[in-house]
């Protein structure tokens, strides 16, 4: 058993049919010795008294708010939570595998430059009794600082028949060197309960594999002419990092129709302008990469041909 | 430590054309380590992350844009900066700050080139004769630190008489082709950054 | 099975003109950028234009404007390529050639022999 | 016009062995390059597009690197069947052009 904050206990447990469970001691948060009773959430059946209360916790029936009173009056709380472990692996029943880039990923993280600042987002399929509370650093074992926001509801989708809820992060590193060699990962750890279970979630990365830049901006077509080419030109984002001669991007233009099976022109730059053929009814767009460390691609800005 | 001194190219820069040939050559060679090493340790999640130029050179420092000299988290470990007169730059420090930053870049590439062709020394003694380093990379490394210019003592190349061992020696590659490839990411800004200034 | 097959070879007169053509098979023949790209005895390609046959629209490289006209026949999925003006430094395989893409090609016709001599 | 150029014309190498030829632009091209085989008698056949991008059904030991001006093909090791004309082609712009092509033979 630990303590993750004030007055909330997570029991880790090896989940099994008849498992022994743990054996826990609950202590009551005051002065008072004599005349103490405890009760478990909103029941008024009386578990036991003193100033201890040992009681063993085998499934969630066990788990919950324990309340200790003296003569109708509340002395403290204690909740527990449980941490099911299944056949040595801890359980990750309340967040979606993400599967992308890999199996069991449920934490995805990505920053638009290098500036330190990151947003971290998860999938969920439950709506109601969730909270998160969401950790992070560079490094572990002498850990430098990066503070996270509160982790807020950033979507939700419907998935056959099924609603789907995206909580998202954003976290920024205290001190921060845009043009730093990362050799220390950052951590990042997420606190998940639902009712009365504990689950913890972690991702480690270097910004470097998380960057994907903004779109390319304020994209502007040139007609070439007597031909059937265009001039298309646009400029870096506002987000990416500067200078931009020291974070440079490559570009990748793409004339294509509606659908992805059309016939397309493509071409790849690392300038701010290229000539491209532009057909009836098709659209330019333009993405961006880091022209030097490979991470993603963002995603496109179009502008249709005509 | 006495840097060599730097007679900059003032028409920078066939050395963004090696730059770039660098970080191809180490990158091509990264992913045929890890596809050719795939039981082993090799990728990026994997190894433990050294850096052999650490307190040795300074090449992020050194070579750090103008721009971002305000930025208080970069000047940290400086030991050089910049800034003088509040961040005001006199041309001849520009000049100097300059020569630094390349002969810093220069050390660095000495430094890895001792490293690999020990290492490759010792490659070419295992039986099972599983990965080699690409000659092309050794050459673009050569190419680079002939097209920065600088006179420095040559840096004996390791020889170790004990028997190697080529499961440590296989990881050691790893680790440090991913080191390579960072610095070689950080000399390519630079290049390109002072290509456009 | 996409395949392109090409007309057969052709003996000119310098001064005259060639209509090579590429019929398409497997696939819808609109979806398809079409290309001619032709190769001298001994040497490398050189790249002469495209045609889009959804439109009709072309591109002809500089040194063949004026001389070479891409044509398309959707109907019979039937690209042509005719070459005016003929010299005996024309003589060369012509080949067809198509992708999704614009600016590479996945696909190659079997090619045509043109051969001008007088 | 843009201009290709290829190294060496001609290659001689022994079966197993690998090979490595390269292409030169006359300008900086990005990753607009892409890579054909010709056997005698046949037509081009696309190996590489995008500079490294592979194709089903081309052999894994085809691949391709290079962005600005210089590009290789490298064959890991050359089979029987590898013996034969190859050829880079730019796509920065048109008109479109090619190598002059680099013969590997049986040495």
């Known amino acids: 058993i630990w303590e993750l904050k004030k007055d909330v206990y997570v029991v880790e447990l090896d989940w099994y049919p008849d498992a022994p469970g743990e054996m826990v001691v609950l202590t009551c948060d005051t002065p008072e010795e004599d005349g103490i009773t405890w009760t478990l959430d909103q029941s008024s059946e009386v578990l036991g008294s003193g100033k201890t209360l040992t009681i063993q916790v085998k499934e969630f029936g066990d788990a919950g708010q324990y309340t200790c009173h003296k003569g109708g009056e509340v002395l403290s709380h204690s909740l527990l939570l449980l941490h099911k472990k299944e056949d040595g692996i801890w359980s990750t029943d309340i967040l979606k595998d993400q599967k992308e880039p890999k199996n069991k990923t449920f934490l995805r993280c990505e920053a638009k430059n290098y500036s330190g600042r990151f947003t971290c987002w998860w999938l969920t399929t439950i709506s109601t009794d969730l909270t998160f509370s969401v950790k992070s650093s560079r490094g572990s074992s002498d850990p430098q600082g990066v503070t996270c926001g509160a982790a807020t509801l950033s979507a939700e989708r419907v998935r056959g028949d099924n609603k789907e809820y995206e909580y998202s992060v954003e976290c920024q590193e205290d001190s921060a060197c845009p043009a730093a060699e990362e050799s220390l990962p950052i951590e990042v750890m997420v606190d998940a309960v639902h009712k009365l279970k504990y689950e913890n979630y972690t991702s480690s990365f270097f910004i470097r594999d998380i960057i994907k830049p903004d779109p390319p901006k304020n994209l502007q077509l040139k007609p070439l002419k007597n031909s059937r080419q265009v001039e298309v030109s646009w400029e870096y984002p506002d987000t990416w990092s500067t200078p931009h001669s020291y974070f440079s991007l490559t570009f990748c233009v793409q004339v294509q129709g509606k659908s992805k099976r059309e016939k397309k022109d493509r071409v790849f730059t690392d300038k701010t302008s290229a000539t491209v053929i532009c057909r009836k009814n098709a659209s330019i767009s333009v993405r961006a990469q880091d022209r030097y460390y490979s991470s993603s691609w963002s995603e496109w800005a179009s502008v249709p041909c005509s | 430590r006495n840097l060599p001194v730097a007679t900059p190219d003032p028409g920078m820069f066939p050395c963004l054309h090696h730059s770039q040939n660098l970080l191809r050559a180490v990158s091509n060679m990264l992913q045929k380590a890890r596809q050719t090493l795939e039981f082993y340790p090799c990728t990026s999640e994997e190894i433990d992350h050294e850096d052999i130029t650490k307190d040795k050179t300074s090449t992020v420092e050194a070579c750090l844009p103008l721009e971002l000299t305000k930025n208080e988290s970069c000047l940290n470990s400086r030991e050089t900066s910049f800034i003088t007169n509040g961040s005001c730059l006199a041309s001849r420090k520009t000049s100097f700050m300059m020569a630094l930053c390349l002969s810093s870049i220069y050390e660095d590439l000495k430094m890895y080139q001792v490293e690999f062709k020990t290492m490759n020394a010792k490659l070419l003694m295992d039986p099972k004769r599983q990965i080699f380093l690409d000659q092309n990379m050794l050459a673009v490394i050569d190419e680079l630190m002939q097209a920065l210019n600088f006179n420095s003592e040559t840096v004996p190349q390791k020889s170790s008489l004990e028997e190697p061992d080529f499961y440590k020696t296989k990881i050691k590659l790893c680790i440090l082709l991913h080191a390579f490839r960072i610095r070689a990411v950080t000399i390519d800004r630079v290049m390109s950054y002072l290509n456009a200034s | 099975q996409v395949q392109l097959v090409q007309s057969g070879a052709e003996v000119k007169k310098p001064g005259s003109s060639v209509k090579v053509s590429c019929k398409a098979s497997g696939g819808t023949f609109s979806d398809y950028y079409l290309h001619w790209v032709r190769q001298a005895p001994g040497q490398g390609a050189e790249w002469m234009g495209w045609i889009d046959p959804e439109n009709g629209d072309t591109e002809y490289a500089p040194k063949f404007q004026g001389r070479v006209t891409i044509t398309a026949d959707e109907s019979t999925s039937t690209a042509y390529m005719e070459l005016s003006s003929l010299r005996s430094e024309d003589t060369a395989v012509y080949y067809c050639?198509?992708?999704?893409?614009?600016?590479?090609?996945?696909?190659w016709g079997q090619g045509t022999l043109v051969t001008v001599s007088s | 016009d843009i201009v290709m150029t290829q190294s060496p014309l001609s290659l001689p190498v022994t079966p197993g062995e690998p090979a490595s030829i390269s292409c030169r632009a006359s300008q900086s091209i990005s990753i607009n390059l892409h890579w054909y085989q010709q056997k005698p008698g046949q037509a081009p056949r696309l190996l590489i597009y995008?500079?490294?991008q592979s194709i089903s059904g081309v052999p894994s030991r085809f691949s391709g690197s290079g962005s600005g001006t210089d590009f290789t093909l490298t064959i890991s090791s050359l089979q029987p069947e590898d013996f034969a004309t190859y050829y880079c082609q730019q796509s920065n712009s048109f008109p479109l052009t090619f190598g002059q092509g680099t013969k590997v033979e049986i040495k």
């Open positions: 050639a198509r992708n999704k893409e614009l600016r590479y090609f996945d696909v």
């Open positions: 995008f500079a490294s």
